[in-house]
Each structure stands twice: as structure tokens, then as C-alpha cells.
């Protein structure tokens, strides 16, 4: 059974992941640039199911494409430093989902824009945090 300290650590990591995802979405929403239209043409795979920490495997597999899209946005008005940001998310995701369990991600048939993708994972974090508090 999880201890209160391990639950607290999980909650903190989820809160950090949530903040990182919200920061990306905020940066994109603030982005007044022709590149934004191009960013929205990129398609992301969505998880068929995302209700447990092991499902973060689906997010991990999309981090490289996410970094590539964010690299497009680099400008003096975009302060998110994709490499550092994605690296941070990757570390959190690996710790949260654990490395000892092998989970094959199942994706939904429909792909999504970066905004839909981020909103989906933000909702995921919020729902799990809510069960922990």
C-alpha cells in the first residue's frame, strides 16, 4: 500500500507535470505568429484510455513530436526553451509511471492538434490529483 509520503511525492510530481503542460498551453495561446497556424497542423496521438499513472506511457511516446513542434515556436516572445521543458517532463513521467512495468500504449483512432493533446493530458493530471487530495 502506498505510504502518505509516497502519495505526497506522487502528488507533487503530478502538480509539476500539470504546471509544465499548462505553461506550454499558455505559451501557445499567447502566441501571435503565423507559425501558430503551422503548429496546429501537426497531429498528435491521443490515448484510448488515460486513467492510471501507467497510461503516461502514451504521453512519453509523444514527447519527441511535442518538442519538435515547440521548436517551431522559438522566438523572443516564446520563453519555454523546449529542450529543457521536455527534458523536465520526461523525468517526471518516468518517475510517475515507473520503469519496472511494461505497458503498451493504445491510441485512439482520431489524432489531435497540440491544443487538444495538451488539454487531454492536463485533464488527466487534474483528475488524478483530485483523487489524491
Amino acid at each position: 500500500a502506498p505510504t502518505s509520503s509516497s502519495t505526497k511525492k506522487t502528488q507533487l510530481q503530478l502538480e509539476h507535470l500539470l504546471l509544465d503542460l499548462q505553461m506550454i498551453l499558455n505559451g501557445i495561446n499567447n502566441y501571435k505568429n503565423p507559425k501558430l497556424t503551422r503548429m496546429l497542423t501537426f497531429k498528435f496521438y491521443m490515448p484510448k484510455k488515460a486513467t492510471e499513472l501507467k497510461h503516461l506511457q502514451c504521453l512519453e511516446e509523444e514527447l519527441k513530436p511535442l518538442e519538435e513542434v515547440l521548436n517551431l515556436a522559438q522566438s523572443k516572445n516564446f520563453h519555454l526553451r523546449p529542450r529543457d521543458l521536455i527534458s523536465n517532463i520526461n523525468v517526471i513521467v518516468l518517475e510517475l509511471k515507473g520503469s519496472e512495468t511494461t505497458f503498451m500504449c493504445e491510441y485512439a483512432d482520431e489524432t489531435a492538434t497540440i491544443v487538444e493533446f495538451l488539454n487531454r493530458w492536463i485533464t488527466f493530471c487534474q483528475s488524478i490529483i483530485s483523487t489524491l487530495t
Epitope: L12, H16, L19, D20, Q22, M23, L25, N26, N29, H79, L80, R81, D84, L85, S87, N88, I122, Q126, S130, T133
Partner: antibody, heavy 113, light 107 residues
């Protein structure tokens, strides 16, 4: 005991820039994201942006986009908020807040010609 | 951006009174709501997060309730040190936004 100590009050002329610092002690600096919030005299609270002290990346409220820059120095456990092209409406107390539960004491910035 | 509307903007009450402040969000924020207390010349102090969870060290006379768009902060028995301005804040989506504040004054 977690503590945030901000730099002292500043008086600036319109068009100038101001850089406010916020030094953290009592916890792992890189562990908590830092928000900046301001409060104009007699007014409510307004979120300006957030920085991840670990990665150094930040995002800002649309209203301040292009005028605000948040940075950090991990060697001194300090985050900075720089606001440029100051106008009289920027006269306010500027707060840093770590994880929303710990706040700095505030820094009064007065913009006056 | 999500708009947060508090009511009333000010109220007068006596020590021992039960005080209720309401906060309404322009769209559902689930339970992602916090309440702060601020005294003149001081930084805001977190009282309640996640709608109803009391921050460590906050007296039990403070309580929060609600979900979705409508939230309430209740002070069961007002104490002299409770006269201050109270703010609600949503952290459901960026940018985080605050209510305009409710000033609790001595009657």
C-alpha cells in the same frame, strides 16, 4: 522554514525598466515553481507569469507578453522579474509566490515622472 | 480567461458572527479553487486550497465548499484577527485568476 525575501522598493521613470529579485531559503530552490503576482494600490491581485526554477523556462500572462522577463540564478536561489517600458499604471506591489502557499513580502514599484 | 466574481465586495460584521463569502467562476473549475486572506501592507496568506482543504495552521473556524462554478468561504465565528480582505483564486487553467476581493470590516 521556507522563506522568500524580495528586493527593496524602487522608484522609476516612465519608459524605464525595473528588475525585482526574490531569494528563496529553507527548501530545495528548484523544487517549486515561482509565480509573480502584482497588486496596484487599493486593487486586487493580478497574475503576471510563472518560472520553473529548475529548467529556467517561463510563461507569462498575455497582458505582459513582450514586456516581462522572468529569470533565475540557481547558484543564489534567486528568481528575477524584469518589467520594461514602465508606465504609471505599473505602480504596484510585486509579489513572488512559491507554490501559492509561500509569498515574498512584496516590492513596491512606483512609476512617476 | 476564467473570470472570478466575488460577493459581496465588502461587509460589516461583529466578533462572533458567522460570515459567508461567495465566489463564482465564469466556467466550471471543478474544485480548483483557493481562498486567501490579506491584511493591509501584507502579502496574501493561503487559507484553503482544493475548495475545502485547510492550509496547515489555519484555524478550523474557516471552511470552504462548492464545486463547478459556485464556491463559498465561511468563517463560523468571526475573530478580531479575521478583519481583512479575502480573495478567491482559480488554478484550473492558465492564467490563474483572482476574484476582486471581499473586505470584511468591523461593524
Amino acid at each position: 522554514q521556507v522563506q522568500l525575501v524580495q528586493s527593496g522598493a524602487e522608484v522609476k521613470k516612465p519608459g524605464a525598466s525595473v528588475k525585482v529579485s526574490c531569494k528563496a531559503s529553507g527548501h530545495t530552490f528548484t523544487r517549486y515553481y515561482m509565480h509573480w503576482v502584482r497588486q496596484a494600490p487599493g486593487q486586487g491581485l493580478e497574475w503576471m507569469g510563472i518560472i520553473n526554477p529548475s529548467g529556467g523556462y517561463a510563461t507569462y500572462a498575455q497582458k505582459f507578453q513582450g514586456r516581462v522577463t522572468m529569470t533565475r540564478d540557481t547558484s543564489t536561489s534567486t528568481v528575477y522579474m524584469e518589467l520594461s517600458s514602465l508606465r504609471s499604471e505599473d505602480t504596484a506591489v510585486y509579489y513572488c509566490a512559491s507554490g501559492w502557499d509561500v509569498w515574498g513580502q512584496g516590492t513596491l514599484v512606483t512609476v512617476s515622472s | 480567461d476564467i473570470q472570478m466574481t466575488q460577493s459581496p465586495s465588502s461587509l460589516s460584521a461583529s466578533v462572533g458572527d458567522r460570515v459567508t463569502i461567495t465566489c463564482r467562476a465564469s466556467q466550471s473549475i471543478n474544485s480548483w479553487l483557493a481562498w486567501y486572506q490579506q491584511k493591509p501592507g501584507k502579502a496574501p496568506k493561503l487559507l484553503i486550497y482544493a475548495t475545502s482543504t485547510l492550509e496547515s495552521g489555519v484555524p478550523s473556524r474557516f471552511s470552504g465548499s462548492g464545486s463547478g462554478t459556485d464556491f463559498t468561504l465561511t468563517i463560523s465565528s468571526l475573530q478580531p484577527e479575521d478583519f481583512a480582505t479575502y480573495y478567491c483564486q482559480q488554478s484550473y487553467s492558465f492564467p490563474p485568476t483572482f476574484g476582486q476581493g471581499t473586505k470584511v470590516e468591523i461593524k
